[in-house]
Structures are given as C-alpha cells and as structure tokens.
C-alpha cells in the first residue's frame, strides 16, 4: 500500500513538476526589466526564451520574436536546449510511470517489469529535473553578469541588440516557476526512484513440496538461494526469481522415477 | 468615436478648491488611463497626473502632488481632477486626455478653463 | 526629469514652403525592447485642444496628411511639414513618452505670411 501511494505521489509530482517546466520554458518572463530605481516606468521590457516584449503603460504590448538563430548568444541557446531536453525526458517519463502504475493493470505485466519501468521513468525524472534547474541557474547566472555590467554599449544577452541606454534586467517569474518545477521534477523522480525498492520482489517464496524417495528424504523447494538439499551444500546462495532458472555450477537434485509426490 | 467632455470655465477664490470633470464615452472607459494636462495662457503644455480607471492606480508629477487628487467614477464613465488651495499660478486651461498605443495622448477634451481671481 | 528643448520657438514661412522643427530630449529616448524611440509630436491650432500628429518618432497618425515626416533617434528628432499649407499654422509640441513624468517641449508657432 505505502509503495503504491508513493509511487502514485512521485508521478503526480513530477507531472506538476514537468507541467510547470514546459510553462516555464513557454513564458516571456524568465528576465525583467530593473525598477529599482525606476519604479513607475511608462515602458516596461521582459524577455524569454523565444521573444522580447514590452508592455507600455498605455497598456499595449509588443512581442518579437527572435527570428534568427546563428545571431542569439551561445548561452541564450544552450537554456533552451536544457529545457527541451528535460521537457522531452520528462514527457517520455510520464509514458513510462504510467505503465509502471501498480494500481493500473496491463495484461499480466511481471512486478519486476513494473519495477524497472518505475525505476526507468524515475531517473528520467531526475534528469529532466536537473536539466530544467541547470537550464535556469546558467539563465540567471547570465543575467547576474549582465547587471552588473555598466557600460552603455552593453550587450543585452538577448537579441543581439546594442542598447544606447543601458536597461538592466533582474530575474522574471519564469526563473521561480522553473526552479520550483524542476525541484518537484526531480523529488518525483527520487519517490519513483523509492517506489522502485518497494516494488521489486526481494525473494520468491514458494510452499514446499515434499519428495518422498526410498534411500533418502529430502525436502526439495525449486528457485530461490533458500532452497537446500540433504545431498549438499548450496554454497553459492544466488537469487534466482525464475523458479525453473538454475545456473551450471548449483548443486541441484532431481527426484527418481521411483519418487512420488 | 472617442469623446471627451470637459465642462465650461470655472472661477475661483484663492484658496479654494475645485473639481473638474471629464465624461467619456465611445469606448471602454476602463480599458484607458486618462491622463491631465495644465497650459497656462500662452505658455505650453505639463502634465499632471494619470489614473487608470480600472483600479483608480494614480502617478502625478511631482509638482502636483498633495495639491490635485485624481478620481473616477466608473458606473458614469468620468474622470475628475480636484485641485485645492488655488492660486493666481493654476489660472489655466485644463485638459483630460485618453492614453494610447506609444504612450501617446491621442484623445484630448475641449478643456476647463479655470480662473482663480478674488 | 527627462528636459525636452524645442527649436525654433518660432518661424514664419510661405505657404509651398518646407518646414522643419527641432526637438532635443536630456535623455536618450529609444527604448532597447523594440528599438523605438518614444517621442511624440502634436499640432495645437488656437483655441483647439492638441491633435496627435506623429507618434514613435516616425509612425503618423491615421487621418494625418503625408506631408507631416518625423525623423531622428536617440536624443534628437525632427517634424518635417513638407510643403506648408495655410491650415497647418499652430503651435507644434514634442513630448517624451518614455518615462514619467510625461514632458513637454516649449512648442515651435508657425506662422504663414
């Protein structure tokens, strides 16, 4: 019960946290013009991933979008890349949790299946997580730079533009939306990760069947590094799921014709 | 189409107090902020405030602050300017204007001309 | 405070004639977001409230005639009347439009003989 509530609450998570990534990714906040000094600005400019807008206090707004590719910043592209990338793994991971659902039945799908589809969907969590976190730190990390950089000619960061009057910009909503989905991404993706340990069957026990042979009596149980016989020592003591798998070097015993059960 | 109506002249006493009025109609009195110029006979343009009917968010220019309030009342679509203690120096034509597309005052009333004389 | 300085306060000219009027802001009026420059130009006949003419520094106003041009970035900017018409006397005013509070320059009169 406990497994399937946590596996059941890192997939919501990191849908919440994959949902809020791509609202990130698509938002035209992630940088915002400084009004430290400025308060009441009667032009206000902010700039995502995909275009710069300015919002006049007449309250129209303008949007362009950057239409080049070779002309935006090595760094500019690379944010991108990262949040594509975690969005891309995070919507494969979401596929596979759902599978991977120990309260949705799929044929007559193995836990073992289910555990390594959840521990599969789980790192991919964790990854996509981590990219949308490390596409955001390098975004603010830039902006950070640029701020400080007073000279009049100062090299936006955006669209290559030249600016005769230095506008700084801070960190915009998008960066905190990105920060907060990528940390739950990336904790659904650890509770999947748990979930995995819970799902997957630690040993097979089987009952016991009793052979009654004429020389000897043995209690033979198939599979499993417990089983033992009265011929031998299992010194190996591998863990074998498959009841009927057996490896070369197991001392194994087999009933005679003369057996019966 | 876009009116502004601004009633007749005002005369005043020094010292008192005045509130103009600006009625619009022809578009959606919320979706503006309506801004108020002064020009003093002869002399040229300043603005004195802005107020966005919406949410009645108000910024004045500095020389205006404390002496003029800007108001709205949006169930009659109309904007009102008061400006208090009057003096000889706020004898002038006032005007409302609406707000546009390049931060621009596209739409202007007729103006209040106010004559503060004892 | 952004200071708008307009010249000439004043000129006389025939009708035909060509026209340009001076406005120069204290701070750089062109905004890095969209690369335009936030100045307007408006036209007061007497007794008349001011009637837009030109806004972005360049982008004239609809039902504005072709013969009214604005020009210029940055700091300094122009209004062009191409060929001036008996209509177009007035007092013509630019006006920052980038920060607040909104500013005004001192307007140019033309006047025709």
């Known amino acids: 019960m406990a497994v399937t509530a946590c596996q059941g609450l890192g997939f919501v998570v990191s849908l919440i946290g994959i949902a809020g990534i791509i609202a990130a990714t698509c938002m035209d906040q992630w940088s915002t013009q400084d009004l430290y000094n400025n308060p009441v600005t009667a032009v206000f400019n902010y700039q995502g991933l995909w275009r710069s807008c300015v919002r006049e206090s007449s309250g129209f707004t303008e949007c362009r979008g950057y239409f080049t590719l070779l002309g935006l910043p090595a760094m500019l592209q690379a944010v991108r890349a990262l949040m594509i990338v975690g969005i891309v793994l995070g919507a494969i991971g979401l596929l596979v949790s759902i599978f991977a659902l120990k309260c949705i039945r799929i044929g007559s799908m193995e836990d073992s299946a289910k555990a390594n589809m959840t521990l599969t969907s789980g790192i991919m969590f964790i990854v996509s997580g981590l990219c949308a976190i490390a596409g955001v730190s390098v975004f603010a990390n830039m902006l950070v730079t640029n701020f400080w950089m007073s000279t009049a000619n100062m090299y936006t960061g955006m669209g290559g533009m030249v600016q005769t009057v230095q506008t700084r910009y801070t960190f915009g909503a998008a960066l905190f939306v990105g920060w907060v989905a990528g940390g739950l991404t990336l904790i659904g993706g650890v509770m999947m990760c748990i979930a995995c340990r819970g799902l997957a069957p630690e040993e097979t026990n089987y009952k016991a069947v009793s052979y009654h042979a004429s020389g000897h009596s043995v209690a033979y149980k198939p599979g499993g590094f417990k089983a033992s016989t009265g011929f031998g020592s299992n010194t190996k003591n591998k863990k074998i799921y498959d009841g009927g798998a057996r490896t070369e070097d197991e001392v194994q015993s087999y009933p005679s014709k003369h057996d019966y059960v | 189409q876009v009116q502004l109506q601004q009633p007749g002249p005002e005369l005043v006493m020094p010292g008192a107090s005045v509130k103009l009025s600006c009625k619009a109609s022809g578009y959606t009195f919320t979706s503006y902020r309506m801004h108020w110029v002064k020009q003093r006979p002869g002399q040229g343009l300043e603005w004195i405030g802005e107020i966005d009917p919406s949410n009645s968010y108000t910024n004045y220019n500095q020389n205006f602050r404390g002496r003029s309030t800007l108001t709205v009342d949006k169930s009659s679509s109309t904007a009102y300017m008061q400006l208090s203690s009057l003096t000889s120096g706020d004898s002038a034509v006032y005007y409302c204007?609406?707000?546009?597309?390049?931060?621009?005052?596209?739409?202007w009333g007729q103006g209040t001309s106010v004559t503060v004389s004892s | 405070d952004i200071v708008m300085t307009q010249s000439p306060s004043s000129l006389t000219v025939t009708a035909g004639e060509k026209v340009t009027v001076g406005c120069k802001s204290s701070?750089?009026?062109?905004?890095?977001?969209?690369?335009?420059?936030?100045l307007t130009w408006y036209q007061q006949k007497p007794g008349q409230p001011p009637k837009l003419l030109i806004y972005?520094?360049?982008t004239r106003e609809s039902g504005v005639p072709d013969r009214f041009t604005g020009s210029g970035s940055g700091t300094d900017f122009t209004l062009t009347i191409r060929s001036v018409q008996a209509e177009d006397l007035a007092v013509y005013y630019c006006q920052n439009g980038y920060s607040y509070p909104f500013t005004f320059g001192s307007g140019t009169k033309l006047e025709i003989k």
């Open positions: 972005w520094a360049s």
């Open positions: 204007a609406r707000l546009g597309r390049g931060n621009t005052l596209g739409y």
């Open positions: 701070q750089s009026l062109l905004n890095s977001g969209n690369q335009k420059n936030y």
